[in-house]
Amino acid sequence: EDELQVIQPEKSVSVAAGESATLRCAMTSLIPVGPIMWFRGAGAGRELIYNQKEGHFPRVTTVSELTKRNNLDFSISISNITPADAGTYYCVKFRKGSPDDVEFKSGAGTELSVRAKPSAPVVSGPAVRATPEHTVSFTCESHGFSPRDITLKWFKNGNELSDFQTNVDPAGDSVSYSIHSTARVVLTRGDVHSQVICEIAHITLQGDPLRGTANLSEAIRVPPTLEVTQQPMRAENQANVTCQVSNFYPRGLQLTWLENGNVSRTETASTLIENKDGTYNWMSWLLVNTCAHRDDVVLTCQVEHDGQQAVSKSYALEISAHQKEHGSDITHEAALAPTAPL
């Protein structure tokens, strides 16, 4: 071939975001005389990237000195690459023309793909808490990555989950992509200390995946179990009744004692005992002066947990005939257990 050829040796170049991309182009001749230009894309909508003849292109530098005698190397370097720079770049030779230079020959094009890291995955749980045996959804989102190929896995306490659905958007070609995944997790009573992990693997991460976490403690509500019992008598005319509130989570709890349906005392749980599984226990007691009662008393421990509907447990306190003859005030006392942080 005795006519000028435009040689773009690389069909494709892949660059990490933030780096510089070198796009190689060589001519086989000095003639026809005229400038070279670099474009992204082809056709009428192509974007001028560099014009040897004129213009200001702050991100573009020429690899060799273009004014150098017999220079046939028209390679360029584009600095600070972003995903928006992805596309096919053409090195185009123009010949001097009057009044305008005329496109003479184009290189075959070099496809620039930009490797952009995914953002740190953000995991979010349900808006409202759910109780054990129920299924809750967790979502994981990450953005701004390229190329499109990406792997997402879910784990609960180190065990891989299988019930999840993942979408990568957009479906077609784009400068960068986003991933959205929803995992369904069945809660168990022991999940207060559990964690779900969303793990993302991508070519830009060099085998070191990104992880986003969420604590199931934010998603679970373990309702308390109540047990009302009478303790051994301190004195002949006093009855000591305790309400053991066990294995609840979170800590927000209000307890009300009722005597024969009438509110006797309300208290808010403060000093809690934390169990190994992260749930809490609390005990409240009531001292009843049996002399003040002529009839049997029904004592009810009513617990409102985490804003839910109250649950209660009752205890029938029998008043002996001897005690019924003597009247006396009821005294109340709450036993407070040592506290532990939430």
């Epitope: 005795d2 001749s29 003639i31 046939l72 001097k96 023309g97 009057s98 009044p99 005329v102």
Partner: antibody, heavy 120, light 108 residues
Framework: QVQLQQSGPELVKPGASVKMSCKAS????????LSWVKQRTGQGLEWIGE????????YYNEKFKGKATLTADKSSNTAYIQLTSLTSEDSAVYFC?????????????WGQGTLLTVSA | ENVLTQSPEKMAVSLGQKVTMTCSAS???????LHWYQQKSGASPKPLIH???NLASGVPARFSGSGSGTSYSLTISSVEAEDAATYYC?????????FGGGTNLEIK
């Protein structure tokens, strides 16, 4: 100093071909574009085309495509023009010329010309 | 192609006279791309002015050039006998490189 020495006059028959030469000296032959210019008797100058000896690549005036073929031999620092299917219209003086700069501008150096006569 | 038209085609002037010849282009030419040559009978063209107004090496100062766009001119301030020749303008703004038809200067 730069010199372009062209071959002697040619008398050829119509329909034949001719190859004329232009030997360069005084500079690096492969680095500079060489042009060929035609001048018919008593007429103006017409640019035929150019050759870049560095890679033996050419560019022609559309008017002379198929008529003229430009070649070069780097080993002898010589450029050639071959004209085919000659007619009386091809009778002219043919000049080789070199730009002042390596890739263009103005013709600073000219050969003395080769007179081609096409006649039966 | 960019056609260059020179006028007049011929002119006869007396020694010492000032001479101006023009070169008109069909398309605009960059001033750096318009050149003038002098060709005497039986000789090859000799560079006279390049880039509209720059004198080639060894060219006397009585020669000058000017112009822009599509209109250019060559002036000889005081013609001498050795100036008898044909003068050609040439453009290097666009392919194909073209020459004007020439102005033949004759000394009376």
């Amino acid at each position: 100093q730069v010199q372009l020495q062209q071959s002697g006059p040619e008398l050829v028959k119509p329909g034949a071909s001719v190859k004329m030469s232009c030997k360069a000296s005084g500079y690096t032959f492969s680095e500079y574009v060489l042009s060929w210019v035609k001048q018919r008797t008593g007429q103006g100058l017409e640019w035929i085309g150019e050759i870049y000896p560095g890679t033996i690549t050419t560019y022609y005036n559309e008017k002379f495509k198929g008529k003229a073929t430009l070649t070069a031999d780097k080993s002898s620092n010589t450029a050639y023009i071959q004209l085919t299917s000659l007619t009386s219209e091809d009778s002219a003086v043919y000049f080789c010329g070199r730009f002042y700069d390596y890739d263009g501008g103005w013709f600073a150096y000219w050969g003395q010309g080769t007179l081609l006569t096409v006649s039966a | 192609e960019n056609v260059l038209t020179q006028s007049p085609e011929k002119m006869a002037v007396s020694l010492g006279q000032k001479v101006t010849m023009t070169c008109s282009a069909s398309s605009s030419v960059s001033s750096s791309d318009l050149h003038w040559y002098q060709q005497k009978s039986g000789a090859s063209p000799k560079p006279l002015i390049h880039g509209t107004s720059n004198l080639a090496s060894g060219v006397p100062a009585r020669f000058s050039g000017s112009g822009s766009g599509t209109s250019y001119s060559l002036t000889i301030s005081s013609v001498e006998a050795e100036d008898a020749a044909t003068y050609y303008c040439q453009q290097w703004s666009g392919y194909p490189w073209t020459f004007g038809g020439g102005t033949n200067l004759e000394i009376k």
